[in-house]
Interface confidence: medium
């Protein structure tokens, strides 16, 4: 089996002129392509992998929401030679957001890493952005985390920082098959320089207060982080947008809430060859669109192309 091979870390790693083909090893009977897109209110980026895969042919796509950070995951596996160039590997509408000046800053200030490498997203190196409220949602918290995509024996990971709705979340995450967006939230100007070591705290659990030694031993209270739940596979012919049914006023993990699944019929992942800037295009700058419009995510047609790197 011959497959396209490439790795894209928010760059042009899967651009047309950088497309490579690889011969798969014995026993490998599927080509795979996976794309994970992340959108903050200040822009969006995607990571992608193409190569020789494992498993069975099929499609899976899913929309996820982590405290106002939107993610979209797509996986496509196929069994014909060079069949893994059907997904649009970049986003079509928001990078960069463009008309942010039309929004009124709400006073919060965060570091922003949208498609930046780990080297450029260290400590206080990344750009600082003013948060604003969008689509009736309040973005006053800051987020520090990572998006990770694993496919074709390759793992791609990029940092994610920006404005979010929650100000206290700790090690929260949303997942798809081989895809994870996770991190922590904080409150205060530029507080998201490094939240890797943030410990769990929930306002519903009283903080630990040191008291004089009691005469009898008190039972200990331990906060449990329940962000490790893995979502189940979405139907292969629908786009599932998973979002909380209520505003996230509480600080629970998204997995602890009732979830509403909206299915868009006919969200086929296949499309004509549109290439690196063809009909569907490789994604890029345009005006900031309504955050509730999930159509801006990739994959409604338009093949994107593979390239250098890979498995």
């Amino acid at each position: 089996l011959e497959c396209y091979s490439c790795v894209q870390k928010a760059d042009d790693g899967c651009s047309p002129h950088r497309m490579k083909t690889v011969k798969c090893g014995p026993g490998v009977d599927v080509c795979t392509e996976a794309v994970g897109a992340v959108e903050t209110i200040h822009g969006q980026f995607s990571v992608a992998v193409r190569g020789c895969g494992s498993g069975i042919p099929g499609k899976n796509d899913r929309g996820l929401d982590l405290h106002g950070l939107l993610a979209f995951f797509q996986l496509q596996q196929c069994s014909e030679d060079r069949c893994n160039a059907k997904l649009n590997l970049t986003l079509r509408g928001l990078n960069p957001a463009g008309n942010e000046s039309a929004y009124e800053p709400n006073g919060a200030e965060c570091y922003s890493c949208v498609g930046l490498s780990r080297e450029k997203c260290q400590g206080s190196m990344p750009p600082v952005v003013n948060c604003y409220n969008a689509s009736g949602r309040v973005y006053k918290g800051c987020f520090d985390g990572n998006v990770t995509l694993t496919a074709a024996n390759v793992t791609v990971s990029l940092p994610v920082r920006g404005c979010v709705q929650d100000e206290t979340c700790t090690r929260d995450g949303v997942t798809g098959p081989g895809f994870t967006l996770s991190g922590s939230c904080c409150q205060g100007p530029r507080c998201n320089a490094d939240l890797r070591n943030k410990t769990y705290f929930s306002p519903r659990i009283p903080p630990l207060v040191l008291l004089p030694p009691p005469t009898t031993a008190a039972p200990s209270t331990r906060a449990q982080n329940s962000s490790s739940t893995t979502s189940t596979a979405a139907p292969t012919t629908t786009t599932s947008i998973i979002k909380p049914t209520t505003a996230q006023a509480s600080h629970t993990s998204p997995h602890e809430m009732d979830l509403e699944v909206i299915q868009e019929e006919g969200a086929s992942l296949s499309g004509g060859a549109a290439g690196h800037g063809g009909t569907a295009g490789h994604g890029g700058a345009a005006g900031h669109q309504d955050r509730s419009n999930m159509e801006k995510y990739p994959g409604k047609g338009g093949a994107q192309i593979p390239a250098k790197g890979g498995s």
């Epitope: 091979s5 928010a10 760059d11 042009d12 651009s15 047309p16 002129h17 950088r18 497309m19 490579k20 083909t21 690889v22 060079r82 970049t90 079509r92 990078n95 960069p96 498609g115 060859a273 549109a274 290439g275 690196h276 800037g277 063809g278 009909t279 569907a280 295009g281 490789h282 994604g283 890029g284 700058a285 345009a286 192309i305 390239a307 250098k308």
Partner: antibody, heavy 117, light 112 residues
């Protein structure tokens, strides 16, 4: 219909500067990787520079690195090439080309840049 | 000197089959990068003829075909016609130069 229209070429002395423009229409310019490719008189094609859809990824050929700057204005559907410290060997027809279908699938008609004293 | 090597000229009579070669190295064609072919008719801009080694954009006759093996590629034109008289260029990505590279071009002459 996809159209790419270059402008800004002309006669310039060595060491001088020129700014080429490429007006795009008939496709979503903000979603397209774009390149400049040049062709010296009677010679072959030479890739000059390449810019991603958002402008965040840029490459240059070694022959123009440090002298030429590629940029784009997606609100105006326009690609630019700022050429400084021009040399006689930069004399060529400059084409802007769209990356699509895994290659340069559309080309402009070209604009001639002549560097001579 | 071009990174990809093509014969400077080729010729054939109408109806004949002509093949144009394109030889690269381990940093471009040999690295697995796909090859594209462009046709440039006299006095006009280049036009994409073959992409992804052997695929034709819509509107390109099936008389044109491409292939790739190892560090080289070739363009075949069967049933040669007078309107095929043009310059033909191969192109591929090059790791060392970090950009697409072109062959020096082959001038195809249709005799008679």
């Amino acid at each position: 219909e996809v159209q790419l229209l270059e402008s800004g070429g002309g006669l310039v002395q060595p060491g001088g500067s020129l700014r080429l423009s490429c007006a795009a229409s008939g496709f979503t310019f903000s979603s397209a990787w774009m390149s400049w490719v040049r062709q010296a008189p009677g010679k072959g094609l030479e890739w000059v520079s390449y810019i991603s859809s958002s402008g965040s990824t840029i490459y240059y050929a070694d022959s123009v690195k440090g002298r030429f700057t590629i940029s784009r204005d997606n609100s105006k559907n326009t690609l630019y090439l700022q050429m400084n410290s021009l040399r006689a060997e930069d004399t060529a027809v400059y084409y802007c080309a769209r990356e699509g279908l895994w290659a340069f699938d559309y080309w402009g008609q070209g604009t001639l840049v002549t560097v001579t004293s | 000197q071009s990174v990809l090597t093509q014969p400077p000229s080729a010729s054939g009579t109408p109806g004949q089959r002509v093949t144009i070669s394109c030889t690269g190295s381990s940093s471009n064609i040999g690295a697995g990068y796909v090859v594209h072919w462009y046709q440039q008719l006299p006095g006009t801009a280049p036009k994409l003829l073959i992409y992804d080694n052997n695929k034709r954009p819509s509107g390109v006759p099936d008389r044109f075909s491409g292939s790739k093996s190892g560090t080289s590629a070739s363009l075949a034109i069967s049933g040669l016609r007078s309107e095929d008289e043009a310059d033909y260029y191969c192109a591929a990505w090059d790791d060392r130069l970090n950009g697409p590279v072109f062959g020096g071009g082959t001038k195809l002459t249709v005799l008679g």
